[in-house]
Interface confidence: low
Amino acid sequence: GLECDGKVNICCKKQFFVSFKDIGWNDWIIAPSGYHANYCEGECPSHIAGTSGSSLSFHSTVINHYRMRGHSPFANLKSCCVPTKLRPMSMLYYDDGQNIIKKDIQNMIVEECGCS
Amino acid sequence: GLECDGKVNICCKKQFFVSFKDIGWNDWIIAPSGYHANYCEGECPSHIAGTSGSSLSFHSTVINHYRMRGHSPFANLKSCCVPTKLRPMSMLYYDDGQNIIKKDIQNMIVEECGCS
């Protein structure tokens, strides 16, 4: 997956730091105070649709076969720049019973972006 | 995730059968001859962006917090109807050396759709 460098407008991963204080979650999340969540942005022209290279690969490759052949309804289906690989992160937080929980939360960090 | 029923245009899962013969893969895929891959389609208005309810949930919920507050660059970031839960499937196929391989291929079947 591409890293956004400001030079291309093709689907890429953009660095972004989330502050839990900013979104009002610091009352239940003990640590960390924030993290690099990142996000995906950019265009998905038809020639790179389905080139996610990761988690959606088989499915998106199959769908792209139909899309490239102009098969309805895929010809009009817009391809999107989305996370294709996400990574977990350890967090320390309070549960409803005010117990302190340490847990790996799945899909917190965007590692790669691709066109759906 | 919603199932598409033709009545709504909100992001939903659409049933779709893939025929390996149709896409010219029947020369290397022994079985099955096809499968219900499904796909996602529909609108993602801002109030349901980030409500994937599954694999992208934490990340998309966080990003949506910023989006709902009109935080640049997320306010203009378009939310997409994408697979949020995929399922593997067993396949029998020939590898490059013409050996017969039986393998669970990850992320073949779209189980749920959501707004990124």
Partner: antibody, heavy 121, light 107 residues
Framework: QVQLVQSGAEVKKPGSSVKVSCKAS????????INWVRQAPGQGLEWMGG????????AYAQKFQGRVTITADESTSTAYMELSSLRSEDTAVYYC??????????????WGQGTLVTVSS | EIVMTQSPATLSVSPGERATLSCRAS??????LAWYQQKPGQAPRLLIY???TRATGIPARFSGSGSGTEFTLTISSLQSEDFAVYYC?????????FGGGTKVEIK
């Protein structure tokens, strides 16, 4: 091979503070919990609190809240436990312990040798 | 916090016999339970984690079972080096809590 090496025995006066160190070697320091467990003479094990060095934030057992401070220095792979307002009942062996694997909900596979803190006037 | 209760407090067993130690949690800890062995003047040693998985280098005579709130540590045939204090510990939630211990002594 993971090793946790603690600082030496201390004798302290009531009302004072003690700071015990725990130096880790033989593994990634940042992503693993370092926990502190104490054991008073002839008594059982008592969890005081823990820190995930990469976060730099600690959590403490309610009993010790406000009296204990757990910190970690990633540059030296060392964790510290400071206990203030010492009283005679704080006389105990203090252990640092580390979880078995990176991630969550793992037991303490690695233990320091223990530091005896004696509080006496 | 989750209270861990061990029984019996003391268990007198002859070498070669079987020892069964119990641990009860005040609420479910799933399988997030460990057993430790401690000998005088030594740090605790991890025996079992995940309620039933033996830690590296632990002999097969040690086995753990249970989930939720009821757990058991079994030592199938006690050796002289097994006479020690055994603690259960839940690590499902912080604060992490230990049981009061069971002392296994020679009969």
């Amino acid at each position: 091979q993971v090793q946790l090496v603690q600082s030496g025995a201390e004798v302290k006066k009531p009302g004072s503070s003690v700071k015990v160190s725990c130096k880790a070697s033989g593994g990634t320091f940042s992503n693993y919990d370092i926990n502190w467990v104490r054991q008073a003479p002839g008594q059982g094990l008592e969890w005081m609190g823990g820190i995930i060095p990469v976060f730099g934030t600690a959590a403490y057992a309610q009993k010790f809240q406000g009296r204990v401070t757990i910190t970690a220095d990633e540059s030296t792979s060392t964790a510290y436990m400071e206990l203030s307002s010492l009283r005679s009942e704080d006389t105990a062996v203090y252990y640092c312990a580390r979880e078995a694997r990176d991630g969550y909900r793992y037991a303490f596979q690695h233990w320091g040798q223990g530091t005896l803190v004696t509080v006496s006037s | 916090e989750i209270v861990m209760t061990q029984s019996p407090a003391t268990l007198s067993v002859s070498p070669g016999e079987r020892a069964t130690l119990s641990c009860r949690a005040s609420q479910s800890v799933s399988s997030n339970l460990a057993w430790y062995q401690q000998k005088p003047g030594q740090a605790p040693r991890l025996l079992i984690y995940g309620a039933s998985t033996r830690a590296t280098g632990i002999p097969a005579r040690f086995s753990g079972s249970g989930s939720g709130t009821e757990f058991t540590l079994t030592i199938s045939s006690l050796q002289s080096e097994d006479f020690a204090v055994y603690y259960c510990q839940q690590y499902n939630n912080w604060p992490i809590t230990f049981g009061g211990g069971t002392k296994v002594e020679i009969k």
